[in-house]
């Protein structure tokens, strides 16, 4: 029961996480105009991975796609790639985990196969979550670097009179969505891996087998051999499951969010 709950919860958490990763990837507000030095701007700029937008005083918002591939910064391309890899892995993981769910019976699928699939999907979710967190963190780092660079040479003018204020960008909502979604996908993946340990056959007790030695009527009974792996191919033997799944997985550390002025 606990295994089913853990697996189900892991699936739901991962599903929410992947939906969040997709949402973050599609969102336009990865970076938003910093209003600290110009709080009264009537023109508000914000940018996503795929297009940049401007909201005008009329309330009208105009967005323009980045219609170039080669002209874009390598970092942006890298972030796009990480997010897409995260989505693809997550989607495959979801597909695999649906078939792996203990509450869903598909034909005569063995528990060992379900355990295998649960572990596979769990690993996929973990990698998916890490990809999202990495992508968002790379973009955030890029923003922080650009922020301080633009602060250093913010005012460009003649004779000390300010002519132009360079637009600075700060963290957009998509970054926080991405971090949370990546974290959820990661947690979901870990839960799937934990559930897999519960699904896997820990021990296999072999039935006593009589060996008839020539000329002797002696029954040879070997002791209950321990299965070397959780996924024994000897499926005809009775399987004994370890109900209490042990969590020996490494503790996952999360990236800290650095506040800046």
């Amino acid at each position: 029961m606990a295994v089913t709950a853990c697996q189900g919860l892991g699936f739901v958490v991962s599903l929410i996480g992947i939906a969040g990763i997709i949402a973050a990837t599609c969102m336009d507000q990865w970076s938003t105009q910093d209003l600290y030095n110009n709080p009264v701007t009537a023109v508000f700029n914000y940018q996503g991975l795929w297009r940049s937008c401007v909201r005008e005083s009329s309330g009208f918002t105009e967005c323009r796609g980045y219609f170039t591939l080669l002209g874009l910064p390598a970092m942006l391309q890298a972030v796009r790639a990480l997010m897409i890899v995260g989505i693809v892995l997550g989607a495959i993981g979801l597909l695999v985990s649906i078939f792996a769910l203990k509450c869903i019976r598909i034909g005569s699928m063995e528990d060992s196969a379900k355990a295998n699939m649960t572990l596979t999907s769990g690993i996929m979710f973990i990698v998916s979550g890490l990809c999202a967190i990495a992508g968002v963190s790379v973009f955030a780092n890029m923003l922080v670097t650009n922020f301080w660079m633009s602060t250093a040479n913010m005012y460009t003018g003649m004779g000390g009179m300010v002519q132009t204020v360079q637009t600075r960008y700060t963290f957009g909502a998509a970054l926080f969505v991405g971090w949370v979604a990546g974290g959820l996908t990661l947690i979901g993946g870990v839960m799937m891996c934990i559930a897999c340990r519960g699904l896997a056959p820990e021990e296999t007790n072999y039935k006593a087998v009589s060996y008839h030695a020539s000329g002797h009527s002696v029954a040879y009974k070997p002791g209950g051999f321990k299965a070397s792996t959780g996924f024994g191919s000897n499926t005809k033997n009775k399987k004994i499951y370890d109900g209490g799944a042990r969590t020996e997985d490494e503790v996952q550390s999360y990236p800290s969010k650095h506040d800046y002025v």
Partner: antibody, heavy 115, light 113 residues
Framework: QVQLVQSGAEVKKPGASVKVSCKAS????????IHWVKQAPGQGLEWIGY????????NYNLKFKDRATMTRDTSISTAYMELSRLRSDDTAVYFC????????WGQGTLVTVSS | DIVMTQSPDSLAVSLGERATINCKSS????????????LIWYQQKPGQPPKLLIY???TRDSGVPDRFSGSGSGTDFTLTISSLQAEDVAVYYC?????????FGGGTKLEIK
């Protein structure tokens, strides 16, 4: 087509309040901000502020902030601008405007403040 | 606040001649986010509300005759009427659409010589 129809002329005494309405039609009311502009007789244009019909958020010119209040009723696609503690220099035509680059204007409401 | 200064205050031009109105802002109206200048030009005739001519410094509004054109960047802008017509007699205003409070120029009265 897009139309902004304003309420009729008003005559008020100093210290009183006036509420001008601006009924919008021909577009999605919540899509664009409604701005208010003052034009004193023979004078230029002066921006009072705007209201965002979608969320009710507003932004005021500091000159009018403590006396002007902008509201909206999305059910009847109407924006309102109330000016309190009227003075003689508030005598002007008040316009509502919307659209990209203020493409659409109301016909104007003349408010006369006289004792 | 951004101060908008229009020149001249009034202008008399012969029919068919070119009319040029200047507008200077105290701060740049250039938005680096989309590389556009947020300046608007209006035409106002007596007893009427202002009519939008040009937005984003150079984009003509739909239905505006192509004899009207806007140019300039940063702090200096120009409205040009290439061939003055009788119906162009009006007061012309420029407006800062970049920063709150939105501010207007004092207006330029265009007349026929």
């Amino acid at each position: 087509q897009v139309q902004l129809v304003q309420s009729g002329a008003e005559v008020k005494k100093p210290g009183a309040s006036v509420k001008v309405s601006c009924k919008a039609s021909g577009f999605t009311f919540t899509s664009y901000n409604i701005h208010w502009v003052k034009q004193a007789p023979g004078q230029g244009l002066e921006w009072i502020g705007y209201i965002s019909p979608g969320n009710g958020g507003s932004n005021y010119n500091l000159k009018f902030k403590d006396r002007a209040t902008m509201t909206r009723d999305t059910s009847i696609s109407t924006a309102y601008m109330e000016l309190s503690r009227l003075r003689s220099d508030d005598t002007a035509v008040y316009f509502c405007a919307t659209g990209r680059g203020f493409a659409y204007w109301g016909q104007g409401t003349l408010v006369t403040v006289s004792s | 606040d951004i101060v908008m200064t229009q020149s001249p205050d009034s202008l008399a031009v012969s029919l068919g001649e070119r009319a040029t109105i200047n507008c200077k802002s105290s701060q740049s109206l250039f938005n680096s986010g989309n590389q556009k200048n947020y300046l608007i030009w209006y035409q106002q005739k007596p007893g009427q509300p202002p009519k939008l001519l040009i937005y984003r410094a150079s984009t003509r509004d739909s239905g505006v005759p192509d004899r009207f054109s806007g140019s300039g960047s940063g702090t200096d802008f120009t409205l040009t009427i290439s061939s003055l017509q009788a119906e162009d007699v009006a007061v012309y205003y420029c407006q800062n659409d970049y920063s709150y409070p939105l501010t207007f120029g004092g207006g330029t009265k265009l007349e026929i010589k």
